[in-house]
Interface confidence: low
Amino acid sequence: GELETSDVVTVVLGQDAKLPCFYRGDSGEQVGQVAWARVDAGEGAQELALLHSKYGLHVSPAYEGRVEQPPPPRNPLDGSVLLRNAVQADEGEYECRVSTFPAGSFQARLRLRVLVPPLPSLNPGPALEEGQGLTLAASCTAEGSPAPSVTWDTEVKGTTSSRSFKHSRSAAVTSEFHLVPSRSMNGQPLTCVVSHPGLLQDQRITHILHVSFLAEASVRGLEDQNLWHIGREGAMLKCLSEGQPPPSYNWTRLDGPLPSGVRVDGDTLGFPPLTTEHSGIYVCHVSNEFSSRDSQVTVDVLDPQEDSGKQVDLVSAS
């Protein structure tokens, strides 16, 4: 006869491990007892359990409550046992020794491998701002046994770097994602993907990118200078910009205070019926926590009584 077992038994942390040991005997052969021991290199054998055909299962004190026989029905030639709630310290070499009649003793070894699934964590880097060079966007760390794989899933262009730390029974892997921040990255997902043989499916943690920026400011409303004439109603100037965080707007007049009756409504400057008093240089100030921009325009209100139109100058400044 011969013993049937596995070279390696793999189990996830906390699960039950079946340690197989089956005697494939000739007709009429019987198994008297099966002894299980842990036999790691450099250490003496540590008894787990003795499975006796007559007296049943005897478990050594160190494994009390953790070693059982598989549920019925049982084959009298099957010396397999269950190791309950596997922990990392259970990883190692095990031996089953089978005493048979009349063929004598047989022994076989297997290795128990305990997979420790990782619990990944994602840490965003410093605040991203347009104009920075290569900057850390996020780092992702996962520790497990064996070492997990950490990769990134994103449409954003960037570079990754990984480092590993080996622990006594596990390894931690940290991967960093670096990028050159630009406004187009705002709202883009950056996903850390952790793979491990102890996971049924990859674990994914998503971080949404936020890049601070402020676009150049410009003023609309003076495209047709002939519309800016005395008496015109509904004239307005609109300041155009965009930013992250969203910017705030402020209007001033360079050559004096804003004329009475002029309304400031966020990015819009609304005029009452135009008079020559409304002529002047108007400045839109745009700002957010990242930066500020200015754009100024010169308004000349035309008098229809005069023949010649006047020039309208537009100037932008940052």
């Epitope: 990392q88 480092r163 590993s164 730390f165």
Partner: antibody, heavy 117, light 106 residues
């Protein structure tokens, strides 16, 4: 502040067991690993083993058959035993603290152990 | 086990000098390296961990660098209190220490 202090006999007979105690203060041994390291002129610094915050142990493969590390949480003490000592086990024995990894941010002052009849 | 080879075994330097100590691992240790300072009759003190990170309270004249198998501890503007023996130690698996570098007064 963080302190570790080793105590035990300074002289041990050959073939007997060396027993040392590390008493700590300023931190909890249930939050940090406590390691044993020895230093001798012939062999330099040698890491012997550790008891981790959760109570599990790891030993240097060269000493695994001779070393046992245990602890008493209530007394903030870690115990070190080295069986079957010989003259070349004569050394200064240190206990040291670590976080998750095997580098040592605080050390005891060390205790000199001589193995001699 | 991974072997750590430290050089030089000893050196003489003066206050104000720059001192460089190197440590070579027998295989890649992925920056899992620490440096310690030990003075006569005292226990070792952590200077640098993870190859480049200064431990709390360590003066900025100390710096660590390196990757793979080659690592360096640099002391800028050596002070009188810096004399002693320096050890490297890897923590990629079972830790081992280098043989030490004794820094003496010239």
């Amino acid at each position: 502040q963080v302190q570790l202090k080793e105590s035990g006999p300074g002289l041990v007979q050959p073939s007997e067991t060396l027993s040392l105690t590390c008493t700590v203060s300023g931190f909890s041994i249930t939050n940090y690993g406590v390691h044993w390291i020895r230093q001798s002129p012939g062999k330099g610094l040698e890491w012997l083993g550790v008891i981790w915050s959760g109570g599990s142990t790891d030993y240097n493969a060269a000493f695994v058959s001779r070393v046992t590390i245990s602890r008493d949480n209530s007394k903030s003490q870690v115990f070190f035993k080295l069986n079957s000592v010989q003259a070349d086990d004569t050394a200064v024995y240190y206990c040291a603290r670590s976080g998750k990894w095997y580098y040592f941010d605080y050390w005891g002052q060390g205790t000199t152990v001589t193995v001699s009849s | 086990d991974i072997q750590m080879t430290q050089s030089p075994a000893s050196l003489s330097a003066s206050v104000g000098d720059t001192v460089t100590i190197t440590c070579r691992a027998s295989q890649n240790i992925y920056s899992n390296l620490a440096w310690y300072q030990q003075k006569q009759g005292k226990s070792p003190q952590l200077l640098v961990y993870a190859a480049t990170n200064l431990a709390d309270g360590v003066p900025s004249r100390f710096s660590g660098s390196g990757s793979g198998t080659q690592y360096t501890l640099k002391i800028n503007s050596l002070q009188s209190e810096d004399f002693g023996t320096y050890y490297c130690q890897h923590f990629w698996g079972t830790p081992t220490f280098g043989g030490g570098t004794k820094v003496e007064i010239k």
